[in-house]
Each structure stands twice: as structure tokens, then as C-alpha cells.
């Protein structure tokens, strides 16, 4: 695929796929698979629709658009680096060898850990944890109050440890983006 779609670890990824139903409600089966489109069907199917509804899906994979209008774009929830790769959207138009198939490349980037240039004495124990999420529109930032409190000792050493890849991985795995200041 010569175009690519991008998301950060912990975000939702969006892979567009559209077709035009012959008439409203006259739907065509569609399958989504991980890996390039094979000759028939989809390999490693993650979601499938039939003439009426979504009839198979796996966790984290769903259709966010109006699939009854032909918007069969795939949303992958809370992505990890392992979600990178080629995905196949196959529109299974009736007839022999009539399917329309599209390969879309998904690139997952590590979540950014972004310390602001704030002096250490300005840190407070009440510092919020932020999770950046993305839907179809602009990114929005939410404060997650449910994460465990980070104590003063952790805060005081955080700036020095941010370059430590193990900490960065821990932060990524938690889905949190720490903003200091």
C-alpha cells in the first residue's frame, strides 16, 4: 500500500473503506483481515459484515461509521505496536471474481512522553495523568483521575528517568502520556 495511516500506542486507529450500496439497506458483505488481501476472502479475519449486520468481530475491532450507507471503515481500539501492518478491506460483490479489495497500511508509533521544561521545585503531588485519545476528529486530552497517585518521590525522580526506555515502555503500556508542569 502506498498510503499509510498512523496512530500512537494507546490511541484508536482508523482505516477507511467505503462502497456504494446498490440501494439503501441493500448491503454487500465485507470482511476485514490482518495481512494483505489474498485471492479469496480475508486472511486472519478481524471483522465481517453480511447483507444485514456485523456478524463477526473480535475484541478491539469495530465499525464506527454508518455501515448501512457503505461506510465500513475499521476502528481498532487501544492499539499496540503489534497492530502495525497491512490490513485488507474486501467488498464481496456478488459474482465470480467480482470482489473489490484494498490493502491499507497501519503504522503504530510509540506514545510520546513529553516533559515540559519546568523546574523540579514546581512539581506537585497533585499532578494529573493525561491520556490522549483520537477518534475521527481532532485529538482530545482527558484527565484520568482513576490512575493511582504518583507520589513525591516518583515525581522528583521522573525527570531524570524519562530517558530510561523501561519507564517509557511502562508509560506506553499504561496508555498514559505524562506531561510535567
Amino acid at each position: 500500500s502506498e498510503v499509510e495511516y498512523r496512530a500512537e500506542v494507546g490511541q484508536n486507529a482508523y482505516l477507511p473503506c467505503f462502497y456504494t450500496p446498490a440501494a439503501p439497506g441493500n448491503l454487500v458483505p465485507v470482511c476485514w483481515g490482518k495481512g494483505a488481501c489474498p485471492v479469496f476472502e480475508c486472511g486472519n479475519v478481524v471483522l465481517r459484515t453480511d447483507e444485514r449486520d456485523v456478524n463477526y468481530w473480535t475484541s478491539r475491532y469495530w465499525l464506527n461509521g454508518d455501515f448501512r450507507k457503505g461506510d465500513v471503515s475499521l476502528t481498532i481500539e487501544n492499539v499496540t505496536l503489534a497492530d502495525s501492518g497491512i490490513y485488507c478491506c474486501r467488498i464481496q460483490i456478488p459474482g465470480i471474481m467480482n470482489d473489490e479489495k484494498f490493502n491499507l497500511k497501519l503504522v503504530i508509533k510509540p506514545a510520546k512522553v513529553t516533559p515540559a521544561p519546568t523546574r523540579q521545585r514546581d512539581f506537585t503531588a497533585a499532578f494529573p495523568r493525561m491520556l490522549t485519545t483520537r477518534g475521527h476528529g481532532p485529538a482530545e486530552t482527558q484527565t484520568l483521575g482513576s490512575l493511582p497517585d504518583i507520589n513525591l518521590t516518583q515525581i522528583s525522580t521522573l525527570a531524570n528517568e524519562l530517558r530510561d526506555s523501561r519507564l517509557a515502555n511502562d508509560l506506553r503500556d499504561s496508555g498514559a502520556t505524562i506531561r510535567i508542569g
Epitope: F18, I93, N98, H136
Partner: antibody
Framework: QVQLKQSGAELVRPGTSIKLSCKAS????????INWVKQRPGQGLEWIAR????????YYNDNFKGKATLTAEKSSITAYMQLSSLTSEDSAVYFC??????????WGQGTLVTVSA | DIVMTQSHKFMSTSVGDRVSITCKAS??????VAWYQQEPGQSPKLLIY???YRYTGVPDRFTGSGSGTDFTFTISSVQAEDLAVYYC?????????FGGGTKLEIK
């Protein structure tokens, strides 16, 4: 690299038909839509129709049903658009463009069609 | 049919300026919007797909944003070679439709 090479300019009489060609190279012809787009002199772009050469599925803009007919020949990796019952309103540049589910990434150079008595 | 409206037919700008072109869809089209540049006598060229993704080889001064019905195309620092007509297009549903075009003129 991906290329779409269109047939040359045509001067035709009103009431006649014409068949424009668009030869593809540099990619798998059967895996992408070929779209046709009309542009009258000094005007904007108007989508005519598309064909998916892998299965020969076609969709037409209602404004061009009965005017345009799309075909594709896998052996020669060429898409065609026939325009029938030509009038002065059909005088325009016609582009073919390769597309998928994410817009028209590659365009032919265009074919100028002039309909004149 | 989905109507794509570009509010300005012409925009005049100077080299180095930031310019934004807007496009409004008559109904929601998710992010299925592309932006094209057409230089005089040339074929259109894809700049932005899926509302905000820059196509391969397109300079990073070109950006796109929006979803639903309102879309914006921005050139952060206009260059002389950017003199062209810019079109938005929706490919959410057939018939695919283009905006009327915005001609960028350099002062």
C-alpha cells in the same frame, strides 16, 4: 512508477461517438479503480464514473448514464471510456485517474475532445 | 448528491504568507476528503487524502484538517510555485464530488 497514459486529442462531429483509452503501468491494474473526470475549459472537475478492472464493476454519475460507458481490458492493462451522441457540451478535457478508498493518487495527462461541425 | 462548497473562488496572497482554504460538505463525509492542486495546463495532483494525511512526496507546508462537514486546507508559507487551483473532493459516497475550486493568486 505509476503511470496512466491517455490517448491523443480528438476532433469529432456532433452525433458521433468516441472511445478514449487510458493505459496503466507500474502497479497491479486489477487492484485499483480507474475513474474518469471531465473538465470543461476554465471550469472545475466533474466525476463521470469508475470501473474496478478486477471484476469490471462500474458506478456512474447519474448525469452521465447513457452518455459514458466504461470498460477495462486486463490483457492490455487499458481502461476505456466510450462517449456517445456527442454534442458541444461534451467538449472538454477528460482525465483518467487511479483511485482506491483514499482518493485519486495518479492522473493521466488528459485527452482534449472537441466536438464541432 | 453530496455538495462540496469552497467559499472562495479566488484568494490573493504573498510569498511567505499562511493561507487557508475551506470546504464544506452538504452532509457528513467522515474524513473521506482529498485536496488536489491543479497548475495551469496540468492534471490535478493529490496533496492530501483522508482529510489530514499528506500524500507521498508532498511538502510539509501543505496540511489538511477537519471531519464531518467542515474541512480546511492550509499552506503554512506560500511559495511562488503554489500558484494553482485547489480542489476539495469527497469520496465518501458516489457520485464523488469536487468543490468548485479556489484559485490561489500570488501578489
Amino acid at each position: 512508477q505509476v503511470q496512466l497514459k491517455q490517448s491523443g486529442a480528438e476532433l469529432v462531429r456532433p452525433g458521433t461517438s468516441i472511445k478514449l483509452s487510458c493505459k496503466a503501468s507500474g502497479y497491479t491494474f486489477t487492484d485499483f479503480y480507474i475513474n474518469w473526470v471531465k473538465q470543461r475549459p476554465g471550469q472545475g472537475l466533474e466525476w463521470i464514473a469508475r470501473i474496478y478492472p478486477g471484476g469490471a464493476n462500474t458506478y456512474y454519475n447519474d448525469n452521465f448514464k447513457g452518455k459514458a460507458t466504461l470498460t477495462a481490458e486486463k490483457s492490455s492493462i487499458t481502461a476505456y471510456m466510450q462517449l456517445s451522441s456527442l454534442t458541444s457540451e461534451d467538449s472538454a478535457v477528460y482525465f483518467c485517474a487511479r483511485g482506491a478508498n483514499w482518493a485519486f493518487a495518479s492522473w493521466g495527462q488528459g485527452t482534449l475532445v472537441t466536438v464541432s461541425a | 448528491d453530496i455538495v462540496m462548497t469552497q467559499s472562495h473562488k479566488f484568494m490573493s496572497t504573498s510569498v511567505g504568507d499562511r493561507v487557508s482554504i475551506t470546504c464544506k460538505a452538504s452532509q457528513g463525509v467522515s474524513t473521506a476528503v482529498a485536496w488536489y492542486q491543479q497548475e495551469p495546463g496540468q492534471s490535478p495532483k493529490l496533496l492530501i487524502y483522508s482529510a489530514s494525511y499528506r500524500y507521498t512526496g508532498v511538502p510539509d507546508r501543505f496540511t489538511g484538517s477537519g471531519s464531518g462537514t467542515d474541512f480546511t486546507f492550509t499552506i503554512s508559507s506560500v511559495q511562488a510555485e503554489d500558484l494553482a487551483v485547489y480542489y476539495c473532493q469527497q469520496y465518501y459516497n458516489t457520485p464523488y464530488t469536487f468543490g468548485g475550486g479556489t484559485k490561489l493568486e500570488i501578489k
